[in-house]
């Protein structure tokens, strides 16, 4: 139940490009530590939850109208890029930096 | 069911400071259009969903491991400030700009 669910936080997740079916065009790396955010954004939102002012307001509105307004959601607040070596459509080898691939921190939004 | 739920988008929400119990310290405004984000971040994430690269990856991992990794969540991508006139602890009247109070746009994160 949501009462027992842990508070919003970063969880470790390694993503294999083979599992995603991308192994034929991504040369390197074979995968990466993507991580993800999960957990409850429940009242009261404490400092660890990196909550925006809007999230604080939304939490209060949710308490008064849970059927209509959801709790804020647990989402990335800091994301990092990774460099990927891949084949383009013309079979050229390209090194490209992909933004917003790795979750560094999570918060209530 | 999640299949029937609309895609991630901005929903209108007017918040009354009286409803929040803040009427004794907030002089003006009486309330504001806070809005909120809600809806599904389901595969495939289209351009309207303002999805990060991480959200695209997480959507695929969720489909393969729904028990372990949640769908990305629908969260604000653009927030605006509002100016608030209020009494401080010493009963002084203060005009202050509060950041991240109004949802302007939503996306999958």
């Amino acid at each position: 139940s949501s009462e027992l669910k842990t508070a919003c936080k970063k969880h470790e997740l390694y993503v294999s490009f083979q599992d995603l079916g991308w192994q034929d065009w991504i040369i390197a790396p074979k995968g990466y530590a993507a991580n993800y955010c999960d957990g409850e954004c429940s009242f009261p939102l404490n400092a660890h939850m990196n909550a925006t002012n809007h999230a604080i307001v939304q939490t209060l509105v949710h308490l008064m109208n849970p059927e209509y307004v959801p709790k804020p959601c647990c989402a990335p607040t800091k994301l990092n890029a990774i460099s990927v070596l891949y084949f383009d459509d013309n079979s050229n080898v390209i090194l490209k930096k992909y933004r917003n691939m790795v979750v560094r921190a999570c918060g209530c939004h | 069911s999640s299949e029937l739920k609309t895609a991630c988008k901005k929903h209108e929400l007017y918040v009354s400071f009286q409803d929040l119990g803040w009427q004794d310290w907030i002089i003006a405004p009486k309330g504001y259009a806070a809005n909120y984000c809600d809806g599904e971040c389901s595969f495939p994430l289209n351009a309207h969903m303002n999805a990060t690269n991480h959200a695209i990856v997480q959507t695929l991992v969720h489909l393969m491991n729904p028990e372990y990794v949640p769908k990305p969540c629908c969260a604000p991508t653009k927030l605006n400030a509002i100016s608030v006139l209020y009494f401080d602890d010493n009963s002084n009247v203060i005009l202050k700009k509060y950041r991240n109070m109004v949802v302007r746009a939503c996306g999958c994160h």
């Epitope: 139940s1 027992l4 669910k5 599992d19 995603l20 999960d38 | 393969m64 729904p66 028990e67 372990y68």
Partner: antibody, heavy 118, light 107 residues
Framework: QVQLVQSGAEVKKPGSSVKVSCKAS????????MHWVRQAPGQGLEWMGY????????KYNENFKGRVTITADESTSTAYMELSSLRSEDTAVYYC???????????WGQGTLVTVSS | DIQMTQSPSSLSASVGDRVTITCRSS??????LAWYQQKPGKAPKLLIY???NLADGVPSRFSGSGSGTDFTLTISSLQPEDFATYYC?????????FGGGTKVEIK
């Protein structure tokens, strides 16, 4: 060794409920999702739903229209599947099955026969 | 919901035969398919996961191939203990759906 042991066979009246248990041993219960699958006599396999005992996250097959509830008790490493408003078509063998991340249902319980008859 | 269609629904074969069972998904599920074997009165047993990966303890005569919407389970040389019913399962969101099954009988 890793195993799932289910409760014994049940005979139930139409309209009543049944609760089947599945006791896990030989692994960390909260590290793996537990699924429930049923099989009517002479028929194929039908997925009912799952629970992740780590966070009590559940998901159900909508074919059961809110009649199924899956729970887990970490203290006894036991998962439960309760099916309410039973009808004769619910007569089936009910299986619990573990599914690791990135894998399929690798360990299954022995099955529990539930017979619904007036 | 994704539909999984297995064919044939039944087949007769002899010991030593090469047997092929196919499974088609109504949507692209990439490599997210499993195969199970079930004998009468027993629980299903995992044979193949992620379309091609052999589960622990499964003999090498079993192999899986395919990706996207079309998948195949092959038994290279049928053994007496292989007479059973085989199910495919798509693992792509929920509900997790099974194929209708293929019964492999002795000719």
């Amino acid at each position: 060794q890793v195993q799932l042991v289910q409760s014994g066979a049940e005979v139930k009246k139409p309209g009543s409920s049944v609760k089947v248990s599945c006791k896990a041993s030989g692994y960390t219960f909260t590290s793996y999702a537990m699924h429930w699958v049923r099989q009517a006599p002479g028929q194929g396999l039908e997925w009912m739903g799952y629970i992740n005992p780590y966070n009590d996250g559940t998901k159900y097959n909508e074919n059961f229209k809110g009649r199924v509830t899956i729970t887990a008790d970490e203290s006894t490493s036991t998962a439960y599947m309760e099916l309410s408003s039973l009808r004769s078509e619910d007569t089936a063998v009910y299986y619990c099955a573990r599914r690791p991340f990135g894998n399929a249902m690798d360990i299954w319980g022995q099955g529990t026969l539930v017979t619904v008859s007036s | 919901d994704i539909q999984m269609t297995q064919s044939p629904s039944s087949l007769s074969a002899s010991v030593g035969d090469r047997v092929t069972i196919t499974c088609r998904s109504s949507e692209n599920i990439y490599r997210n398919l499993a195969w199970y074997q079930q004998k009468p009165g027993k629980a299903p047993k995992l044979l193949i996961y992620a379309a091609t990966n052999l589960a622990d303890g499964v003999p090498s005569r079993f192999s899986g191939s395919g990706s996207g919407t079309d998948f195949t389970l092959t038994i290279s040389s049928l053994q007496p203990e292989d007479f059973a019913t085989y199910y495919c399962q798509g693992i792509w969101g929920t509900p997790l759906t099974f194929g209708g099954g293929t019964k492999v009988e002795i000719k």
